[in-house]
Interface confidence: low
């Protein structure tokens, strides 16, 4: 449906508040270094212009595309070249190349200061003094640090952020009320950002077909009673929504997501029995709820898959006539029967089925050739099952911190060229799979664990892509989206790695470690562990454990000392010498 003025159309659909919030998110995700005040000024100018177009859609420039309007506005920033360097060259291009250029310059790891949480009273005062600015600042700070954050979902986070301050700033114990809520929002926000980053990577690096396959599998697990045609429609609409958000078209994305939620709720009888509660909520909560809704019960009388996909004499005829539809039906039928499988496993099975048909449908006796295709699935299913079983046993034995350390050592030995902060961040997140998934019964472990690992390994892939240092990482990240985890699992110690020179400075600690939170202290220790492995990749578990135990004792001792700084200086030298001796450095 063509509109005379796209900007007026979106302003009317979304309303002023959401329009302004989404434009701010879009600008902050593109120009991540720009000060807050500059962005607010740009957003206000765009909003005023949108209002003139609402009043008269034929007014000057109202017929321009949103990319043209937004790109022109971003290119008015005076300090573009000094702040962003070659990104300023984007402004010499015409649409759509200019927008593509801006997208390519999005930085997954921007050089921005860590967000420090002020005292609760300070935050509450700022909230009461100017609620609107306070909430805009939240959107801005999250968006610039997470340039692929799912924009309509960020509006939902902002709504919860506002609710937390509204409630807790009136509470008797403000901190007890507010801090757990902020912690929860921070952790959920990081998880949401990482999940969306995988969706965007899937679309941008592997194409629409890969994303659609993922969506067919996931939606079929979630809505097993829905008809294939219904799932296909949802997949098409969902792909459009995520393509738009990943492409920076945030107004269209939010608008289309609202339409999709409306459609799902109007047609819930034919989609899922689990949607009733979600559909009674307001828009932002409704969309979030639908995205997280539990799997519906499987229909009771589903027939065997073999009849249509192995035993039928028409398999090759059907495959030849409409390959993607036939494979889509296979994936739909397999996924709705297997909520106990990870999406990536289902996609591996579909890929195996496709490869088999490609080979067998050209053979002399196709049916004889593909008759045993389901037997090929067995090892593919058993591999993640065994891996999860082993790692959950290890997690239960060690606890989260030591399990993270085991993964730190494992991954540093696999890809020692990767930067220490990235190895620490990724391994810590990999280690969280234990507390997140191992508590689940068998039937829920694999979808929880392997699909979570896909999200975490994508973080490694996008961070590594910015500054590639390891051919092995590049290979695992680019060869196959669904085989990333098996590819990394299969990596052994990198025998080609030349150990890092020993640098005593890396292992010098100061009294400031004593005032850190437990989490920050763990990160310091884990950073030291990665560095140790980089110096001595062939160190045994026992050697590393002995050094880390000594290190923990050293920190504890010096943090209890009267003259902490002297203790760290003197005992630190002894620790370094003892560690060098223990590891033969």
């Amino acid at each position: 449906d063509a509109h005379k003025s796209e900007v007026a159309h979106r302003f009317k659909d979304l309303g002023e508040e959401n329009f302004k919030a989404l434009v701010l998110i879009a600008f902050a995700q593109y120009l991540q270094q720009c000060p807050f005040e500059d962005h607010v000024k740009l957003v206000n100018e765009v909003t005023e212009f949108a209002k003139t177009c609402v009043a008269d859609e034929s007014a000057e420039n109202c017929d321009k595309s949103l990319h043209t309007l937004f790109g022109d506005k971003l290119c008015t920033v005076a300090t573009l070249r000094e702040t962003y360097g070659e990104m300023a060259d984007c402004c010499a291009k015409q649409e759509p190349e200019r927008n593509e250029c801006f997208l390519q310059h999005k930085d997954d790891n921007p050089n921005l200061p860590r967000l420090v949480r002020p005292e609760v009273d300070v935050m509450c005062t700022a909230f009461h003094d100017n609620e609107e600015t306070f909430l805009k600042k939240y959107l801005y700070e999250i968006a610039r640090r997470h340039p692929y954050f799912y924009a309509p979902e960020l509006l939902f986070f902002a709504k919860r952020y506002k609710a937390a301050f509204t409630e807790c700033c009136q509470a008797a114990d403000k901190a007890a009320c507010l801090l757990p809520k902020l912690d929860e929002l921070r952790d959920e926000g990081k998880a949401s950002s990482a999940k969306q980053r995988l969706k965007c990577a899937s679309l941008q690096k592997f194409g629409e077909r890969a994303f659609k396959a993922w969506a067919v599998a996931r939606l079929s697990q979630r809505f097993p009673k829905a008809e294939f045609a219904e799932v296909s429609k949802l997949v098409t609409d969902l792909t459009k929504v995520h393509t738009e958000c990943c492409h920076g078209d945030l107004l269209e994305c939010a608008d289309d997501r609202a339409d999709l939620a409306k459609y799902i709720c109007e047609n819930q009888d034919s989609i899922s029995s689990k949607l009733k509660e979600c559909c009674e909520k307001p828009l932002l909560e409704k969309s979030h709820c639908i995205a997280e809704v539990e799997n519906d019960e499987m229909p009771a009388d589903l027939p065997s898959l073999a009849a249509d996909f192995v035993e039928s004499k028409d398999v090759c005829k059907n495959y030849a006539e409409a390959k993607d539809v036939f494979l889509g039906m296979f994936l739909y039928e397999y996924a709705r029967r297997h909520p106990d499988y990870s999406v990536v496993l289902l996609l591996r099975l579909a890929k195996t089925y496709e490869t088999t048909l490609e080979k067998c449908c050209a053979a002399a006796d196709p049916h004889e050739c593909y008759a045993k295709v389901f037997d090929e699935f067995k090892p593919l299913v058993e591999e993640p099952q065994n891996l999860i079983k082993q790692n959950c046993e290890l997690f239960e034995q060690l606890g989260e911190y030591k399990f993270q350390n085991a993964l730190l050592v494992r991954y540093t030995k696999k890809v020692p060229q990767v930067s220490t902060p990235t190895l620490v961040e990724v391994s810590r997140n990999l280690g969280k799979v234990g507390s997140k998934c191992c508590k689940h019964p068998e039937a829920k472990r694999m979808p929880c664990a392997e699909d979570y690992l896909s999200v975490v390994l994508n973080q490694l892939c996008v961070l590594h892509e910015k500054t590639p240092v390891s051919d092995r990482v590049t290979k695992c990240c680019t060869e196959s989206l669904v085989n990333r985890r098996p590819c990394f699992s299969a990596l052994e110690v990198d025998e080609t790695y030349v150990p890092k020179e020993f640098n005593a400075e890396t292992f010098t600690f100061h009294a400031d470690i004593c005032t850190l939170s437990e989490k920050e202290r763990q990160i310091k220790k884990q950073t030291a562990l990665v560095e140790l492995v980089k110096h001595k990749p062939k160190a045994t578990k026992e050697q590393l454990k002995a050094v880390m135990d000594d290190f923990a004792a050293f920190v504890e001792k010096c943090c209890k000392a009267d003259d902490k700084e002297t203790c760290f200086a003197e005992e630190g030298k002894k620790l370094v010498a003892a560690s060098q001796a223990a590891l033969g450095l």
């Epitope: 009673k225 829905a226 008809e227 294939f228 045609a229 219904e230 009888d269 034919s270 989609i271 229909p299 009388d301 027939p303 249509d308 039928s312 028409d314 005829k317 059907n318 006539e321 409409a322 539809v325 036939f326 039906m329």
Partner: nanobody, 115 residues
Framework: EVQLLESGGGLVQPGGSLRLSCAAS????????MSWVRQAPGKGPEWVSA????????RYAESVKGRFTISRDNSKNTLYLQMNSLRPEDTAVYYC????????GSQGTLVTVSS
């Protein structure tokens, strides 16, 4: 894209007959069992009848047995439902679906049985 387009609905008196058609496209029609599902105003979807891919095996809900006949023409990619001895309680929107789930994925055609 998979598409299912129903037609043939309308207003009919009790005891009358209608023949519904469903034109299918975007998938290999001849490979899949098909069903008719109906949804009466204010109620959930109800499975009516099913037919296998070749047309040999047909099934019916108790409420329509002996009155409705499902058939298909694979050369035309079309599914049919012949409805005889219609009753007021047969008033509903009728949908064709792939497979045998009591859910709907298309626009449907309205059948109203009333004197």
């Amino acid at each position: 894209e998979v598409q299912l387009l129903e037609s043939g609905g309308g207003l009919v008196q009790p005891g009358g007959s209608l023949r519904l058609s469903c034109a299918a496209s975007g998938f290999t029609f001849s490979s899949f069992g098909m069903s008719w599902v109906r949804q009466a105003p204010g109620k959930g979807p109800e499975w009516v009848s099913a037919i296998d891919s070749g047309g040999a095996d047909t099934r019916y809900a108790e409420s329509v047995k002996g009155r409705f006949t499902i058939s298909r023409d694979n050369s035309k990619n079309t599914l049919y439902l012949q409805m005889n001895s219609l009753r007021p309680e047969d008033t509903a929107v009728y949908y064709c679906t792939i497979g045998r789930s009591a859910s709907r994925g298309s626009q449907g055609t309205l059948v109203t049985v009333s004197s």
